[in-house]
């Protein structure tokens, strides 16, 4: 056969679906690889062909579209399973072609089992809610296109294993779940089960997401440098190790990049000749506020090093701050005999 533009196995689109549930999978060619859509391709006389390779096999096979009750079917650029089975797991290929043109891409499909608490190997999306921020909603994800707007599905929401029924601050509202006042206790996995009829059968769509309650923007502040501060003086003798921690608190801010860095005499440590090392550690509070600590270390400090300016800097979307460490050379203690002699008025 003639050459085909092969986009290979698109592992970025590792698709996971639940066993025994419908799944609709769009050919990724039109979404991510080609500059035209299916309608344009179809109008131009191109045909979309599907085939697959079973898990742990090398043989490409055509997809069987003649199964009972049309369990697997194709509609435009969508491959439908009504429903999926565990052994549908494999690599699926969609190929667009005519006599002069060919383009194809493969993608992995994994059919996973869930237990009665909706635990599974499925990778869960995370939805962040602001703590004590007023009414916030999550929406049952990825259910568009499964049933027409004329069909009114029933939706049951669960927190963990249990139906959300008559909860204090969590209210199911169809496809949405409203949190009246989000609290740390609302952290957890939430599942919507959407039930809809189709051709005399009833199908479930199960969708689970993780809710994480995070710091509110109402409470967000610029970075706070706890150390260095005015109360601690780093007093060293030449030859000793100098250790200065820079500890910074960052309020949680959605999509904010938190940065901490040291300057020595106004330059980044990399840009000067001192033998300096910097180690960073990061910790998070329950609401994802962040504390970053960068410890500046000079193994054997010189008297010149002790005269330099050491400044800790921090930046977030809320602003930038800096604080200088108080570093000085320790004055050697006077020799004992001299001190005594002076004390007795000796000359």
């Amino acid at each position: 056969s003639e050459r085909c533009d092969d986009w290979g196995l698109d592992t970025m689109r590792q698709i996971q679906v639940f066993e025994d549930e419908p799944a609709r999978i769009k050919c990724p060619l039109f979404e991510h690889f080609l500059k035209f859509n299916y309608s344009t391709a179809h109008s131009a006389g191109l045909t979309l062909i599907w085939y697959w390779t079973r898990q742990d096999r090398d043989l490409e096979e055509p997809i069987n579209f003649r199964l009972p009750e049309n369990r697997i079917s194709k509609e435009k650029d969508v491959l439908w399973f009504r429903p999926t089975l565990l052994n549908d797991t494999g690599n699926y290929t969609c190929m667009l072609r005519n006599t002069t043109y060919c383009s194809k891409v493969a993608f992995p499909l994994e059919v996973v089992q869930k237990d009665s608490c909706f635990n599974s190997p499925m990778k869960l999306p995370v939805h962040k809610l602001y703590i004590e921020y007023g009414i916030q909603r999550i929406t049952c994800p990825n259910v568009d296109g499964y049933f027409p707007s004329s069909v009114k599905p029933t939706i049951t929401w669960y927190m963990g294993c249990y139906k959300i029924q008559n909860f204090n601050n969590v209210i199911p509202e169809g496809m949405n779940l409203s949190f009246l006042i989000a609290l740390i206790s609302n952290n957890g996995n939430y599942t919507c089960v959407v039930t809809y009829p189709e051709n005399g059968r009833t199908f479930h769509l199960t969708r689970t997401l993780t809710v994480k309650v995070v710091g509110s923007p109402k409470n967000a502040v610029p970075p706070v440098i706890h150390s260095p501060n005015d109360h601690v003086v780093y007093e060293k003798e030449p030859g000793e190790e100098l250790l200065i921690p820079c500890t910074v608190y960052f309020s949680f801010l959605m999509d904010s990049r938190n940065e901490v860095w040291w300057t020595i005499d106004g330059k980044k440590p990399d840009d000067i000749t001192i033998d300096v090392t910097i180690n960073e550690s990061i910790s998070h509070s329950r609401t994802e506020d962040e504390t970053r600590t960068q410890i500046l270390s000079i193994k054997k400090v010189t008297s010149e090093d002790l005269k330099r300016s050491y400044v800790c800097h921090a930046r977030s979307a809320k602003g930038e701050v800096a604080k200088a460490a108080k570093v000085k050379q320790k004055v050697p203690a006077p020799r004992y005999t001299v001190e005594l002699a002076c004390g007795f008025g000796a000359t």
Partner: antibody, heavy 120, light 107 residues
Framework: QVQLVESGGGVVQPGGSLRLSCAAS????????MHWVRQAPGKGLEWVAV????????FYTDSVQGRFTISRDNSKNTLNLQMNSLRAEDTAVYYC?????????????WGQGTLVTVSS | DIQMTQSPSSLSASVGDRVTITCRAS??????SNWYQQKPGKAPKLLIY???SLQSGVPSRFSGSGSGTDFTLTISSLQPEDFATYFC?????????FGGGTKLEIK
Amino acid sequence: QVQLVESGGGVVQPGGSLRLSCAASGFTFSSHGMHWVRQAPGKGLEWVAVIWYDGSNKFYTDSVQGRFTISRDNSKNTLNLQMNSLRAEDTAVYYCAREGLRAGYYFDFWGQGTLVTVSS
Amino acid sequence: DIQMTQSPSSLSASVGDRVTITCRASQRISFYSNWYQQKPGKAPKLLIYAASSLQSGVPSRFSGSGSGTDFTLTISSLQPEDFATYFCQQSHSTPLTFGGGTKLEIK
């Protein structure tokens, strides 16, 4: 402890009406879906109707759709089944049952049942 | 509607026996299957929900398994109080449906 007590059963003529009630106690009634299930003499179990915890959804088996109405009063912890246009085949013991809070529609507690006899 | 086909319809066994009752759904229902026990003149009692979860207070000799279309209730060692009728039920979607029942009798 959980208690469900049905009442309102009796003998009624075909075409007649009857209203069954179920008094619930020992649990938070407004947190559970509630169901009616029936059992004809010497036969198996047949699900009749469900009402969601907040009354927002009601579903019925096909044979009673349009004739029976399920309702609840969360302030009084009661479940009702209004049965109209009764037929001989509606003769059964009617159980009210509490829906469990885990996945799916299942019945974790049942009342002792009330007998409805439709006969001329 | 989803049909639940239960077998056998009756079963004779002795105390101490291991007993298995099966139920087949007419369409795939994932784990949405439950088992009940009923004694004459009494209301049914939940034994197993979500295919394999043991209801609180039910003896551990009862177990459930299965997924998709085929489900099993197993009693590992029959006790005298276990002689009763057993029903499976699908909790996947309305109308909810029960199997025809299995009458477990003393041999």
